[in-house]
Interface confidence: low
């Protein structure tokens, strides 16, 4: 799996979207988990409604919400009041029995508050480039692809 980068501004909300094949994952609940260490487990943060038919209902755990458009095939996670400690590597998962398939690996970046009505995208600085081998930057705020590695985020 490639890693998709979502960038948010501290104190604001960030929406993460995870598209999937609605037929392949029909009837499956979904979850959002945080990766603990490069080889460590993915710790569940929040999962969709226990009844799959009610997956469209938003469920919260603290400042994190999850909702699933099972027909359109899009899982949406909202991180409210984003804080620096929210930065890190996450996964969107599709659950079946005790197993979980990874729908998308997500790197959440938290950038400084855009004071003085600056464009939020300006706080994200690296320029655009032609290639980004192991990651894709999702346009949750204005910015573009960049080249280089994504080191594994610190877990502390």
């Amino acid at each position: 799996h490639n890693t998709t980068v979502f960038q948010g501004v501290a104190g604001q909300s960030l929406q993460v979207s995870c598209p999937y094949d609605s037929m392949k994952h029909w009837g499956r609940r979904k979850a959002w988990c945080r990766q603990l260490g490069e080889k460590g487990p993915c710790q569940r943060v929040v999962s969709t409604h226990n009844l799959w038919l009610l997956s469209f209902l938003r469920r919260w755990n603290g400042s994190t919400a999850i909702t699933d458009d099972t027909l359109g095939g899009t899982l949406t996670i909202t991180l409210r009041n984003l804080q620096p400690h929210d930065a890190g590597l996450y996964q969107c998962q599709s659950l079946h029995g005790s197993e979980a398939d990874t729908l998308r690996k997500v790197l959440v970046e938290v950038l400084a508050d855009p004071l003085d009505h600056r464009d939020a995208g300006d706080l994200w600085f690296p320029g655009e480039s032609e290639s980004f081998e192991d990651a894709h930057v999702e346009h949750s705020i204005s910015r573009s692809l960049l080249e280089g590695e994504i080191p594994f985020p610190p877990t502390s």
């Epitope: 501290a10 620096p84 930065a87 890190g88 790197l107 970046e109 938290v110 950038l111 400084a112 600056r118 464009d119 995208g121 300006d122 706080l123 994200w124 600085f125 690296p126 320029g127 655009e128 480039s129 204005s142 910015r143 573009s144 692809l145 960049l146 080249e147 280089g148 590695e149 994504i150 080191p151 985020p153 610190p154």
Partner: antibody, heavy 118, light 112 residues
Framework: QVHLQQSGSELRSPGSSVKLSCKDF?????????MSWVRQKPGHGFEWIGD????????IYGVKFEDKATLDADTVSNTAYLELNSLTSEDSAIYYC??????????WGQGTLVTVSA | DVVMTQTPLSLPVSLGDQASISCRSS???????????LQWYLQKPGQSPKLLIY???NRFSGVPDRFSGSGSGTDFTLRISRVEAEDLGVYFC?????????FGGGTKLEIK
């Protein structure tokens, strides 16, 4: 007033390494704003070395510096670091840390002079 | 890499004069997000550079309004309407639309 304080001048012999530091006195912004390192060589102008986002240690290097420089950051002391290895006379320069804002190198440290000489 | 070409290399002026510095990039600096990340800096002898203008035409905080930036695409200009003694130094442009970020060679503003 933004204040980035860099470590003092360094004299090194060829083949050795050096680690420069840059303390940011804005502890709230430091973890979540990109820090960039730039060097200035007389007659060669400015060269961008790389960026780091301290909160998650995300690093982006200029191709020229991928094997030369290592960027690091400590969010406890609000300090960014630049380590340069396998030094040659070509690495003699003033090295600046800068903090990003407005899509630009908005705030600059005072610079650290690195001299590589046998 | 994007090459930033600055002209002139040296600009002798009298105090109170208008001064113009040109910066040309080897490719368009319009970012995918619609912004143009072209900056102007001033470096005085023995000092760090200071940001004057960001995103082509926006003055950074504390920068006097005698400084103005203009241009688009690949051609950009910094103007100083009435040069004062404190304006003397080396001006350089920089782009941060494309990796790696690159810089112009500098223009030395000096007294005629």
């Amino acid at each position: 007033q933004v204040h980035l304080q860099q470590s003092g001048s360094e004299l090194r012999s060829p083949g050795s390494s050096v680690k420069l530091s840059c303390k940011d006195f804005d502890s709230e912004v430091f973890p979540i704003a990109y820090m960039s390192w730039v060097r200035q060589k007389p007659g060669h102008g400015f060269e961008w070395i790389g960026d780091i986002l301290p909160s998650i240690g995300r690093r982006i290097y200029g191709v020229k510096f991928e094997d030369k420089a290592t960027l690091d950051a400590d969010t406890v002391s609000n300090t960014a670091y630049l380590e340069l290895n396998s030094l040659t006379s070509e690495d003699s320069a003033i090295y600046y840390c800068t903090r990003k804002d407005y899509g630009s190198l908005a705030y600059w440290g005072q610079g650290t002079l690195v001299t590589v000489s046998a | 890499d994007v090459v930033m070409t600055q002209t002139p290399l040296s600009l002798p002026v009298s105090l109170g004069d208008q001064a113009s510095i040109s910066c040309r990039s080897s490719q368009s600096l319009v970012h995918i997000n619609g912004n143009t990340y072209l900056q102007w800096y001033l470096q005085k002898p023995g000092q760090s550079p200071k940001l004057l203008i960001y995103k082509v035409s926006n003055r950074f905080s504390g920068v006097p309004d005698r400084f103005s930036g203009s241009g688009s695409g690949t051609d950009f200009t910094l103007r100083i309407s009435r040069v004062e003694a404190e304006d003397l130094g080396v001006y350089f442009c920089s782009q941060s639309t494309h990796l790696p970020y690159t810089f112009g060679g500098g223009t030395k503003l000096e007294i005629k």
